[in-house]
Amino acid sequence: EDELQVIQPEKSVSVAAGESATLRCAMTSLIPVGPIMWFRGAGAGRELIYNQKEGHFPRVTTVSELTKRNNLDFSISISNITPADAGTYYCVKFRKGSPDDVEFKSGAGTELSVRAKPS
C-alpha cells in the first residue's frame, strides 16, 4: 500500500506586490485521517498560514470548494501580497490524534518571492 505523499509541485513562485499568490498542494490519499495546514517557515517558530478548523485568515482562500467531497487539492491563494509575505510555505498533513493531532508528513515547500509593484 502506498503511503500518503504531500506534493507541492512548485519549488518557487514569484508574485508582484499587491497581487495574489497561489500555493499549490495535493495529497495522494485521503488517509490517514487528519487535517491539513499551511505554514510559513519550518521548525518551532513557523507561522500558521491556514487551518480550516480554527482561526481567522482573511487573506487566504482555498482553491477547491470547502464543500468538495473527498478532496485531495489543498492549494491556497493569498491575496494582496506584500514583501513581508516572502518566505517558504509548507503544506503539512497531520494524523488525527486525541487530544492533539500529530504531524505526519510535510510537502517540500514552495518559496514565495515578492517583486516590486510595477510602476
Epitope: E3, V33, Q52, K53, L66, R69, N70
Partner: antibody, heavy 120, light 108 residues
Framework: EVQLLESGGGVVQPGGSLRLSCAAS????????MTWVRQAPGKGLEWVST??????YYADSVKGRFTISRDNSKNTLYLQMNSLRAEDTAVYYC???????????????WGQGTLVTVSS | EIVLTQSPATLSVSPGERATLSCRAS??????LAWYQQKPGQAPRLLIY???IRETGIPARFSGSGSGTEFTLTISSLQSEDFAVYYC??????????FGGGTKVEIK
C-alpha cells in the same frame, strides 16, 4: 455500486469474544477510512471505532476491548470484540467514511448490520 | 465531547405538511454536521452533509440549514416514505464522532 456486507454476529456469553467482518465492494477500499457504528435495541446510533491506514480510533466504552483492523487485499474491515458485556448488545453497522474538503468524516454508505447479543 | 440534542423527540405530521427538525450542538461545530434517515429494520441513509448539502439522489424536499450550534432539517412536504427516525452527527471535533438522540417523524 458501493456495497458493504457485515457478518460474524451472534449470541455470546458475557466475557466472550466475537469477530465481525465487513466485505466491501464497488469503491477503492484502501483509499477510504472505515467505521463501525452500533445501535442497541430501540436506541440511537453510537460510534464505535474508525480506521484510516495505520491509524485507529475508539470510543471510550470499547477502548482496550475492541480492535479494528482492515485487510486491503481482501477489501475487508474487521472488528475483534473481546470481554463482551451485556451493554455491547446491538446491531453493528460498518460504514464508509467520506470527507468534505478540509473537514472531518461522515458516513455515506452503510451495511445492513449484524446483530450481536451478549447474554448468559 | 460534543453533545448533540435533537428536538422534538417525536414529531407528528400529516402527509403533505412541512416538518422541521432541530439539532443543537453543545459547542461550535461550524458546518461539520450531517443528517441521516433510518427506517425500521434498515441501516441509516445519508441525507445531508456540510449542514446544507444534499447527498446525491436525495429529493429536493429535504433541506438543511444552520451553522455553529443550531441546525435544522426541513422536509417541505412529507411523503409516506419520509416517516422514519432522523439523526444528526457532528464531525468537527472527534474522537468521538457523536450523534443526536434522534427525532421520530410519525404520521399524525
Amino acid at each position: 455500486e458501493v456495497q458493504l456486507l457485515e457478518s460474524g454476529g451472534g449470541v455470546v456469553q458475557p466475557g466472550g469474544s466475537l469477530r465481525l467482518s465487513c466485505a466491501a465492494s464497488g469503491f477503492s477500499f484502501s483509499n477510504f477510512a472505515m467505521t463501525w457504528v452500533r445501535q442497541a435495541p430501540g436506541k440511537g446510533l453510537e460510534w464505535v471505532s474508525t480506521i484510516g491506514s495505520g491509524d485507529t480510533y475508539y470510543a471510550d466504552s470499547v477502548k482496550g476491548r475492541f480492535t479494528i483492523s482492515r485487510d486491503n487485499s481482501k477489501n475487508t474491515l474487521y472488528l475483534q470484540m473481546n470481554s463482551l458485556r451485556a451493554e455491547d448488545t446491538a446491531v453493528y453497522y460498518c460504514a464508509k467514511d467520506s470527507t468534505v474538503s478540509w473537514s472531518g468524516d461522515f458516513f455515506d454508505y452503510w451495511g445492513q448490520g449484524t446483530l450481536v447479543t451478549v447474554s448468559s | 465531547e460534543i453533545v448533540l440534542t435533537q428536538s422534538p423527540a417525536t414529531l407528528s405530521v400529516s402527509p403533505g405538511e412541512r416538518a422541521t427538525l432541530s439539532c443543537r450542538a453543545s459547542q461550535n461545530v461550524k458546518n461539520d454536521l450531517a443528517w441521516y434517515q433510518q427506517k425500521p429494520g434498515q441501516a441509516p441513509r445519508l441525507l445531508i452533509y456540510a449542514a446544507r448539502i444534499r447527498e446525491t439522489g436525495i429529493p429536493a424536499r429535504f433541506s438543511g440549514s444552520g451553522s455553529g450550534t443550531e441546525f435544522t432539517l426541513t422536509i417541505s412536504s412529507l411523503q409516506s416514505e419520509d416517516f422514519a427516525v432522523y439523526y444528526c452527527q457532528q464531525y468537527y471535533d472527534w474522537p468521538p464522532f457523536t450523534f443526536g438522540g434522534g427525532t421520530k417523524v410519525e404520521i399524525k
